[in-house]
Each structure stands twice: as C-alpha cells, then as structure tokens.
C-alpha cells in the first residue's frame, strides 16, 4: 500500500510544496491540501498505517518528524518545533505518541 493508492499524486505534490519552507508546517492546512480531510475513515486509517513505519500501532515522535516523507520521499523533515506542535495537537491521551483514533480525530478537526 502506497500513499498514492489513497491520495492523488498531484495533491501530494502541491501540499508538500506549500510547506517547503522551514517552520511553515500547519497540519490543518496540510491535511486539507493533501486531500485527507475529505477521505472516509477507512482511508484515513490506511494513511495512518503507512505513516506508522515500524507497525507499532502508533506514530511516535521520530516518525512524526518525518511525516512529510511518508507522503513524498523527497520532502523535508519537520523541525523539532514543528514536530512538538504536531505531537501536542494529536496526542490526546498524553502518552507521547499518536494512535490511529487520535490521528483520525486530528484529521477530522482540520
């Protein structure tokens, strides 16, 4: 399963390009631009599982830092500040990582 099985390559390219500048990442705008916001719950979960590289059932902080690479391999890494901001937004239960339901909520709230 690759990201382009769920999202269009064109939308991915546009969204990655829009946040190419350092410290410009805004997860709400990104999820909208990449087309994730309008996907159904099962498709959102598929995206989660792609981003969960080590199949732990969670997107941990280091995986969050490379979240853009999960959409496009040539994308940049998030800065430490961007990563912390994203983690704080998504980690509802305070365990330091984002589970599938938390990710779904994060997308839905975008």
């Amino acid at each position: 399963m690759s990201m382009t099985d769920v999202l269009s390559a064109e939308d991915i390219k546009k969204a990655i390009g829009a946040f190419a500048a350092a410290d410009s990442f805004d997860h709400k705008k990104f999820f909208q631009m990449v087309g994730l916001k309008k996907k159904n719950p099962d498709e959102v979960k598929k995206v989660f599982h792609i981003l969960d590289k080590d199949k732990s059932g969670f997107i941990e902080e280091d995986e969050l830092g490379s979240i853009l690479k999960g959409f496009s391999s040539d994308a940049r890494d998030l800065s430490a500040k961007e990563t912390k901001t994203l983690l704080a937004a998504g980690d509802k239960d305070g365990d330091g990582k984002i589970g599938v339901e938390e990710f779904s909520t994060l997308v839905a709230e975008s």
Epitope: D54, G57, D62
Partner: antibody, heavy 117, light 107 residues
C-alpha cells in the same frame, strides 16, 4: 519481504561468552528499534531489552536480569543486530529471538543457547 | 515494572468454538498491547497490535479488545491450526513485559 535470521547459538560453559547475530532484510533497519527476547525451555517469553533507532541515537535499554552482562549493538551498514553475552549462567539457557519494531511486529526463528558444564 | 497476568494458562476447546484469552495490566498501558502466537517449532508471529489492530495476513476470526485494564484476544471459531501457544506483550513502558502464556489445546 521482511526477514530476520538469528545465528551463533550453541553450547557454552558457565562463565563463558557467546555472541549472537541477527541478520535482517526487507525493512528500513535504521528506523527500527531492535529487541532481544528469550525463552527458557518450557517457560514464557522474556524481554531482554532493545537498541533504539537512528532518531534516538541507537541508545540501549536492558532488563534487570541481563544488565551489565549482555550488550546489544548493531551494524547499520549491514542491517545486522548483535547480542554479546558474557559471564553466562545456567539460567541463561534458552532460545534467543531478535525482534524488530517498537511493537515487535517482526521476529526471527530463534537460536538455541545452552549453558552447561 | 508492569506485570501482565494472563489467563487462563491452558484452555481446552473444540473446533469451531469461540474462545477468549485475557491479560490484565498492573498499571496503565493505554493501547500498547500485542498478542503473539507461538507454534510448537518455536515460530512466533504477531496477531494483534495496539490492542485491536489485526496484523497483515492474520485471519479475521482473531480480534482484540480492551475493557479497563483487561485486554482480550478472541478467536471467533477455532480452526485446527489455532491450537498453539499465545502471549500478550505490553510495550507502553520499559521493561516491556509478557504475559505467562496460554496453551490452547484441542478437546
């Protein structure tokens, strides 16, 4: 296809040393935590610890039962995990497994270690 | 350390029967719990991760759930290859800990 293959098990005398290897393929090794788990004959699984991924500086965590005697290392260029076991005791006799990922989603087939005089 | 108390330690059941295995966590582990299957030759395979996510290729008769500190693995209709050993594993905090295991035997 993900593959983990342990090797290096065998018979060793109490007080002796042994190094186990876990050759891996099919996943981004440097992104993965790698664990060692053992199972004494007829008993439950026991987690020995892990070596973290590149993002966490390949730092290690050990269980109390092996801390100070066992050492984890990894060759990231070859995607191989190692377990150096020193001052072995009879109670270290077990099948040793390597496991990949923070959720231990990938497992090797195990290698048997017998510590006996 | 977090203790994982797994029950029952052994279970006799018939083909087609529905069975549930349980692990109780001594401290909060959130959803950081896996269920593993071990065959007689020692081969270990993860069935369920993060409490309820089915691993790729695992039959849909397996499912995982949680009620408070109790975590369950349910097999909806036992097949012959299911009569092996099962372990839970918590990976919420170090040291990661396993349950004592359940041996599932054919009646």
């Amino acid at each position: 296809e993900v593959n983990l293959v342990e090797s290096g098990g065998g018979l060793v005398q109490p007080g002796g040393s042994l190094r186990l290897s876990c050759a891996t393929s099919g996943f981004p090794f440097t992104d993965f935590y790698m664990s060692w788990v053992r199972q004494p004959p007829g008993k439950a699984l026991e987690w020995l610890g892990f070596i973290r991924n590149r993002a966490h500086g390949y730092t290690t965590e050990y269980s109390a039962s092996v801390k100070g005697r066992f050492t984890f290392s990894r060759d990231n260029s070859q995607s191989i995990l190692y377990l150096q076991m020193n001052t072995l005791r009879t109670e270290d006799s077990a099948t040793y497994y390597c496991g990949g990922g923070r959720g231990l989603g990938y497992w090797g087939q195990g290698t048997s270690v017998t510590v006996s005089s | 350390d977090i203790q994982m108390t797994q029950s029952p330690s052994s279970l006799s059941a018939s083909l087609g029967e529905r069975v549930s295995l349980t692990c109780r966590a001594s401290q909060d582990i959130g959803s950081s719990l896996n269920w593993l299957q071990q065959e007689p030759d020692g081969t270990i395979k993860r069935l369920i991760y993060a409490t309820s996510i089915l691993d790729s290729g695992v039959p849909k008769r397996f499912s995982g759930s949680r009620s408070g500190s109790d975590y369950s693995l349910t097999i909806s209709s036992l097949e012959s290859e299911d009569f092996v050993d099962y372990y839970c594993l918590q990976y919420a905090s170090s040291p990661w800990t396993f349950g004592g295991g359940t041996k599932l035997e054919i009646k």
